[in-house]
Interface confidence: low
């Protein structure tokens, strides 16, 4: 069962997925000049068996210099859902991934792929948060939210963090109520995850021992 | 191999403002938070505040209305004032490197030799 | 405020056995928690993080583990070195410190 909407927007921070349930689609998007090839696969798919997952289908971009149009091919109104979006840097690495069963790991880049990655998460993922460069948690429950299913209908858990930072005013844990979301930022806002050279993160989930390693900037 | 140092004057009088430096040698001041810890003689720890090399700052509650950090990043220098001091101010004051990993973040891995204020007349 | 809480205050063991240090939050700190050792007239050097990781150039004779208010730190095997006054922080809301275990020599 797909997620009907995208996980929380929490201020001055980012979410990840440090593994993928199966049943996740990821859009093959091309960069601005390029397109998914004619025969190819509209999306990957986490798939597998009880001791084995990967992605099926493979994206595949070639230059569409040779036709009158960069217009992005996308998956159809009836493949789409609702779209998913994490904006990451191509060349993301991971370091030290344990297999989780069920699960997919992030699907290294295909050439010529566009910057944003549209994932459409499922039932039981989970995406894990933490605050930008320059910002730092200070109220913190669990930074992570579930896309859960309750009375039919899909809805994400609140990760329990408020990032602060660039001087703004500070409040004791209880004084104030975690921000859900960027104040005046549209449901379609996605969190921006883009390459700078001078600041790395480490972030040890430890629900999944799972730990990757990036760069990031807030844009 | 990055050390903390540090500096200001050992003895500061009742209702007079604290002032001390911390100079960061063997490595930059950037992309690391900086905290103030202090340690009242035989007793725990307690933070006092941080600051990150853009200027952004956070302080202990219970200190905040006294408590100003700043950073000088031209110098590798952050500095402590701690206004209208008592005799309860009289501590062992620390810098110290703030880890930086992701949400899971606020820990020391360096700490300054430390430095005795006494607030007394 | 999470309030810390270590026990024992003062702790004797005879260098090569082994010791074990507690600390309690007031309520849940996830995994977010840390151990210093501090030795008279000396700052701070962390020991463990993440309630269960050895920093850098600690010895494997040191470990953490526990999660959420229980926190226990181990030292399988004392060394002459080890005596020291150990400080438990937790980092899950703002900072914390415990007030301090004495480890002496028996």
């Known amino acids: 069962e797909l997620c009907d909407d995208d996980p929380p927007k929490i201020t001055h921070a980012t979410f990840k997925a440090v593994a993928y349930k199966e049943g996740t689609m990821l859009n093959c998007e091309c960069k601005r000049g390029f397109r998914r090839i004619k025969s190819g696969s509209p999306y990957m798919l986490c798939t597998g068996n009880s001791s084995h997952s990967s992605w099926d289908n493979q994206c595949q971009c070639t230059s569409s210099a040779a036709r009158n149009t960069t217009k992005q091919v996308t998956p159809q109104p009836e493949e789409q859902k609702e779209r998913k979006t994490t904006e990451m840097q191509s060349q993301m690495q991971l370091a030290d991934q344990v297999s989780l069963p069920g699960h997919c790991r992030e699907p290294p880049p295909w050439e010529n792929e566009a910057t944003e990655r549209i994932y459409h998460f499922v039932v039981g993922q989970t995406v894990y948060y933490q605050c930008v460069q320059g910002y730092r948690a200070l109220h913190r429950g669990p930074a992570e939210s579930v896309c859960k299913m309750t009375h039919g209908k899909t809805r994400w858990t609140q990760p329990q963090l408020i990032c602060t930072g660039e001087t703004e005013p500070s409040q004791f844990p209880g004084e104030e109520e975690p921000q859900a979301s960027p104040d005046g930022l549209p449901e379609s806002e996605t969190s921006r995850l883009v390459t700078t050279t001078d600041f790395r993160i480490q972030t040890e989930v430890a629900a999944t021992m799972e730990t990757f390693i990036f760069t990031t900037e807030y844009q | 191999q990055v050390q903390l140092q540090e500096s200001g004057p050992g003895l500061v009088k009742p209702s007079e403002t604290l002032s001390l430096t911390c100079t960061v040698s063997?490595?930059?001041?950037?992309?690391?938070?900086w905290s103030w810890i202090r340690q009242p003689p035989g007793k725990g720890l307690e933070w006092i505040g941080y600051i990150y090399y853009s200027g952004s700052t956070n302080y202990n509650p219970s200190l905040k209305s006294r408590v100003t950090i700043s950073v000088d990043t031209s110098k590798n220098q952050f500095s402590l004032k701690l206004s209208s001091v008592t005799a309860a101010d009289t501590a062992v004051y620390y810098c110290?490197?703030?880890?930086?990993?992701?949400?899971?973040?606020?820990?020391?891995?360096?700490w300054g030799r430390g430095t005795l204020v006494t607030v007394s007349s | 405020e999470i309030v810390m809480t270590q026990s024992p205050a003062t702790l004797s063991v005879s260098p090569g056995e082994r010791a074990t240090l507690s600390c309690r939050a007031s309520q849940s700190v996830s995994s977010n928690l840390a151990w210093y050792q501090q030795k008279p007239g000396q700052a701070p050097r962390l020991l463990i993080y993440g309630a269960s990781t050895r920093a850098t150039g600690i010895p494997a004779r040191f470990s953490g583990s526990g999660s959420g208010t229980e926190f226990t730190l181990t030292i399988s095997s004392l060394q002459s070195e080890d005596f020291a006054v150990y400080y438990c922080q937790q980092y899950n809301n703002w900072i914390t410190f415990g007030q301090g275990t004495r480890l002496e020599i028996k």
């Open positions: 063997g490595g930059s001041i950037r992309s690391y938070y």
């Open positions: 110290a490197r703030d880890i930086l990993t992701g949400y899971s973040d606020w820990f020391f891995d360096l």
